[in-house]
Each structure stands twice: as structure tokens, then as C-alpha cells.
Interface confidence: low
């Protein structure tokens, strides 16, 4: 019996031994994608579906509220600035927008998990694309912030201040454009699909196995590994420079950005490790069995929930780590509550150091 994963990939003896019981190591080949036959049957999803039904709607609802409030507050604070936004603030504003748009899709996914997808194929494509656009945008914008800091501090190059203010906007547009490109498969392949086994309709991909694996690899690399590597590289160099210059104030100013990067890593690493296991199963490097698949499905639900938590985490980090954000937020609340008290509308200082709540004239983070 010939055991092949696809026309291009033949299993080796070790993999054949592991998969001897099955016709194929993976069960999701499209009719035109691979000429292999016949597949292992889809696994029963009772446990993972029941888990999702109980766990996801509650989590998504909570994240929706927290994310909307938190990121709304960040956007409000940034947009209430009288002066032009600094490069980092602009990136943070875009990050808040990305996080807000992502959490806006969560109620739809909560309904999908609790009951079924009742919103049709059009909204399935839009919600899926919106979700992924903002997943990628969040990671890439954090990488942009770290690269901006790196240029400013390590190379003393104020890329976005020397050139026209439009440069940071162009960078953000490039990020959004790239994310839109990454989300093309969502627009093309996502649809509301009726699952006969579950007797329910769900918003899911309908494309060949190789495409699914490629998309997961893209998500892993472009949405996690690359941004994380950029962040790690940039901040390692920044910290080295600051330690050498013994800039205690500047080191203190780096607190927020280090915490934001650590939060990104902590929130998304578990999910991407699970995705990696899934990729390995897709490729046949790990034998696929129903027990493992069920555990991976549940792990994916839990770790993706942790990942989406990151959308709500940034505002909280700003609030608890960033002194200036608290000041600005407090002032904004007072201004909204007491519109007649003109004294409260006054900016604390017109100096460049206070013109932003994330940057200082020394091109590092302020005390926040």
C-alpha cells in the first residue's frame, strides 16, 4: 500500500510506521489538491465543541467589553492631544484601532461557538478577514514601534521626525496594506459551511490542505515569529545602549515598552506553539489521532483566548505602567465631566518632553 501525503511529499519509513494504520496521515485533502485516497475519517468533535460552547462565549463577551473600553480610552487620550502625535503615539493609535476592530468581531465568534454561524457567508468573510487583518496589524505595529525606538536610540536616527510627518502614516498604511494582503485568503476561502456531522453551520475555510498549512505557517511567521524577532533584536540593542550610557531615567522610561513586548510574547507564544503542533500534524511529522486532535482543538481555544486577551492588555499596561497615560486619562475624564472648568483644559507644559505620553525629546519612552 502506497502511503503518500500528496503528490510531492512521500512519507519516510519512520512516518509510515507511525501511520501504518491509516490510508493517509492527514484527512483534509481537497479533491484537486492531492490525488491520494482515501482519508482517515474526521474525528468526533464532541468534547472540543462542548468546551468551546461553554468557554468561548463568556470569554469573548468579556474581552469585547474590556477591549472596547480600554482601546477606546487609549484612542480618546491620543486623539485629545492638542499637539501633533509623535511617531510612537501614531503607531499606538493604530494599534488601538487594530485591537478595537479585532474585539468588534468577537461577539460574532461567540455566537458561532455557542450556537452556529447565523450571519451568512458575506459577514463570515468580512469578520474573518477583519479578525486576521487586526491580528497581523497588532503584531506588525508593535514591531514598527520597536524599530522606531531602535533607530532613535541606537542609531540616533529620528526617522519620522526628520522627514515629513506623513512618513509614519505611510508606514502605517503599508502595515495595513500588508495585513489586507494576508487576509485575502479569508475573503476568498471563508464561507458559512453546513457541517452534516454537527448539523450546524459554521464560518470556516473551504480550501485544500496545502493551503491551510501554508496559511498557518504564514500566520506563525508573519504574525508572530518575525515581529517577535524584530522586537527582541531592537530592544536588546536599546537596553544595551541604555545600560552602557547608565541612563537610569531612560531605562525607567523603557519599562512600558519592555512590558508591552513581554506581554505580546506571553500572550501569543502558547497559541503559536499549538499552531506549530497542528502544522506538524498536517505535514505528517506528528501522527494525527483523534485524542491528540481533540487536545489540540481545546488547547487552540484556550490559547487563542489568551492571545485575544492581548487586545485588552495594552490599555491596562499603559494605565498601570505609564504614569503619563494615567495623567492624560484623568485629565480627559475631568474635562468631559467638568467642561466649564477651563483650568483643567490647560496642558501641563508646552515643552517637547510633555507633548507626548509615550516619547521624550531624548527619543525614548517617557516615565509614563
Amino acid at each position: 500500500m502506497v502511503l503518500e501525503v500528496s503528490d510531492h511529499q512521500v512519507l519516510n519509513d519512520a512516518e509510515v510506521a507511525a501511520l501504518l494504520e491509516n490510508f493517509s496521515s492527514s484527512y483534509d485533502y481537497g479533491e484537486n489538491e492531492s490525488d491520494s485516497c482515501c482519508t482517515s475519517p474526521p474525528c468526533p468533535q464532541d468534547f472540543s465543541l462542548n468546551f468551546d460552547r461553554a468557554f468561548l462565549p463568556a470569554l469573548y463577551s468579556l474581552l469585547f467589553l474590556l477591549g472596547l473600553l480600554g482601546n477606546g480610552a487609549v484612542a480618546a487620550v491620543l486623539l485629545s492631544r492638542r499637539t501633533a502625535l509623535s511617531s510612537t503615539d501614531t503607531f499606538l493609535l493604530h494599534l488601538a484601532v487594530a485591537d478595537t476592530l479585532l474585539v468588534l468581531t468577537l461577539p460574532l465568534w461567540a455566537v458561532d461557538a455557542a450556537v452556529q454561524w447565523v450571519f451568512g457567508s458575506g459577514l463570515c468573510k468580512v469578520a474573518g478577514a477583519l479578525f486576521n487583518i487586526n491580528f497581523y496589524a497588532g503584531a506588525l505595529l508593535l514591531a514598527c514601534i520597536s524599530f522606531d525606538r531602535y533607530l532613535n536610540i541606537v542609531h540616533a536616527t529620528q526617522l519620522y521626525r526628520r522627514g515629513p510627518p506623513a512618513r509614519v502614516t505611510l508606514t502605517c498604511l503599508a502595515v495595513w496594506g500588508l495585513c489586507l494582503l494576508f487576509a485575502l485568503p479569508d475573503f476568498i476561502f471563508l464561507s458559512a459551511h453546513h457541517d452534516e456531522r454537527l448539523n450546524a453551520t459554521h464560518c470556516q475555510y473551504n480550501f485544500p490542505q496545502v493551503g491551510r498549512t501554508a496559511l498557518r505557517v504564514l500566520q506563525l511567521v508573519a504574525g508572530f515569529l518575525l515581529p517577535l524577532l524584530v522586537m527582541a533584536y531592537c530592544y536588546a540593542h536599546i537596553l544595551a545602549v541604555l545600560l552602557v550610557s547608565r541612563g537610569q531615567r531612560r531605562l525607567r522610561a523603557m519599562r512600558l515598552v519592555v512590558v508591552v513586548v513581554v506581554a505580546f510574547a506571553l500572550c501569543w507564544t502558547p497559541y503559536h506553539l499549538v499552531v506549530l503542533v497542528d502544522i506538524l500534524m498536517d505535514l505528517g511529522a506528528l501522527a494525527r489521532n483523534c485524542g491528540r486532535e481533540s487536545r489540540v482543538d481545546v488547547a487552540k481555544s484556550v490559547t487563542s483566548g489568551l492571545g485575544y486577551m492581548h487586545c485588552c492588555l495594552n490599555p491596562l499596561l499603559y494605565a498601570f505602567v505609564g504614569v503619563k497615560f494615567r495623567e492624560r486619562m484623568w485629565m480627559l475624564l475631568l474635562r468631559l465631566g467638568c467642561p466649564n472648568q477651563r483650568g483643567l483644559q490647560r496642558q501641563p507644559s508646552s515643552s517637547r518632553r510633555d507633548s507626548s505620553w509615550s516619547e521624550t525629546s531624548e527619543a525614548s519612552y517617557s516615565g509614563l
Epitope: D7, Y27, D35, C38, S40, P41, P42, P44, C290
Partner: antibody, heavy 123, light 106 residues
């Protein structure tokens, strides 16, 4: 309407050969994996061979491996089973059957069957 | 190979009876598939993915089970239900069928 029509059955001596054909109509033959399943008189069903939709991959149980060869001609919408070194225990009604596609995946059960052709191996 | 054992092999029942056919697997299977066959005819897909009725199958039929034990139940037997029923697995190669359960009129 999906139709599968087997032919080529008959009486053959032990050690002899026979080639069965299955003419398919009513569906896009090139998109489906196909199989042969047999049923000895008064007995249960036994899977004999499977071929992928493009004809590149074939699968057999140990009982017929090396003796039977499944093939297809997608241009003619026809499935074949070449049976060599026939034994008395190969006597059965041979059905050709279609594998369904579920969510883009080939499934190992059979959604349509032909009426069968009887193969008798006897001296 | 996974062996499928159906019980009973023969079953005599009357119209209106509730009938249950069991299929036991020698090792766990993910799903089970059921076929109906009438004398001189080709088998017909009856139930797939353990519990999904094939097109045209009356709702009095139901399938259930998991792991090693699966059942096909007919809530109220009708004259056209008298036939032989086979279970099948394709969790592992080779595809195997049960020996069949012949349902006869009492």
C-alpha cells in the same frame, strides 16, 4: 442520476484471469475516488481495491495484493479491475462503488454502488 | 485489522417493533457507517458519520455509539425495513465490514 454499471464477470478456472469494467455516468467521474467491493454468495461484504480520482494511487487489502490491479480511464468514465491468479475464494459478486467527498475530503465509505457482476472461479 | 462483529446475526421481529442492531469493533473507531441490502440488490448507504441518515432514509432509523460499540435503531419497524444491515469502519486500513444482521419478519 448517478449510475454505475459493472460488466466482465463470468466463469473462470483457478489460476485464470478476468477483467471487470464499471461504466460510470451521472457525475463527474474524474472528481471521485472509486473502489471495488465483493460479496461471496451468502456472505458479507469485503473491500477489494481503491483508486484515487486521478488514478495515481491504488490501495488493496492483503488478500488480493499482487494479484488484483485497479485502474481507471477518466476519458472513458470507466473503472477496471484486472484479476489474475484467481482462486476459488475469489468467487463473488463484484460491485464498483463511489467514495463520497465530504468537505473536500475523500471518505472511505461508499455512497453509490453498481448492481454487481458475478465472478465464478471453478474448475 | 479491525474486526467488526454484529449482533444478532439474525433477528425476527414484527411490524411496529423497536429494533436495535449492535456493531462492536475490536479496537476503537472514530465513526461507523451502515448499509442496507435487500436480496439480489446492491447495498445502499444508510447511515454515515455514526448518526447521519443518508438521503431518503426514514427518520425512524437512528444511529449512535462511540469507540468500540455502535448501534442502529429502528423505532417502529415497517415492512420495507426487512433486509440485511452491514456496519463498516474506515478508521484504519483495510476497510472492514461486519458480517451483517438479517432482519426477518416474525
Amino acid at each position: 442520476e448517478v449510475q454505475l454499471l459493472e460488466s466482465g464477470g463470468g466463469l473462470v478456472q483457478p489460476g485464470g484471469s478476468l477483467r471487470l469494467s464499471c461504466a460510470a455516468s451521472g457525475f463527474t467521474f474524474t472528481s471521485y475516488a472509486m473502489s471495488w467491493v465483493r460479496q461471496a454468495p451468502g456472505k458479507g461484504l469485503e473491500w477489494v481495491a481503491t483508486i484515487s480520482h486521478g488514478g495515481k494511487y491504488t490501495y488493496y487489502p492483503d488478500s488480493v495484493k499482487g494479484r488484483f490491479t485497479i485502474s481507471r480511464d477518466n476519458a472513458k468514465n470507466t473503472l477496471y479491475l484486472q484479476m489474475n491468479s484467481l482462486r476459488a475464494e475469489d468467487t463473488a459478486v463484484y460491485y464498483c462503488a463511489r467514495h463520497p467527498i465530504y468537505s473536500g475530503n475523500y471518505q472511505g465509505y461508499f455512497d453509490y454502488w453498481g448492481q454487481g457482476t458475478l465472478v465464478t472461479v471453478s474448475s | 485489522d479491525i474486526q467488526l462483529t454484529q449482533s444478532p446475526s439474525f433477528l425476527s421481529a414484527s411490524v411496529g417493533d423497536r429494533v436495535t442492531i449492535t456493531c462492536r469493533a475490536s479496537s476503537g473507531v472514530n465513526y461507523l457507517y451502515w448499509y442496507q441490502q435487500k436480496p439480489g440488490k446492491a447495498p445502499k448507504l444508510w447511515i454515515y458519520f455514526t448518526s447521519t441518515l443518508a438521503s431518503g432514509v426514514p427518520s425512524r432509523f437512528s444511529g449512535s455509539g462511540s469507540g468500540n460499540e455502535y448501534t442502529l435503531t429502528i423505532s417502529s419497524l415497517q415492512p420495507e425495513d426487512f433486509a440485511t444491515y452491514y456496519c463498516q469502519q474506515f478508521t484504519s486500513s483495510p476497510y472492514t465490514f461486519g458480517q451483517g444482521t438479517k432482519l426477518e419478519i416474525k
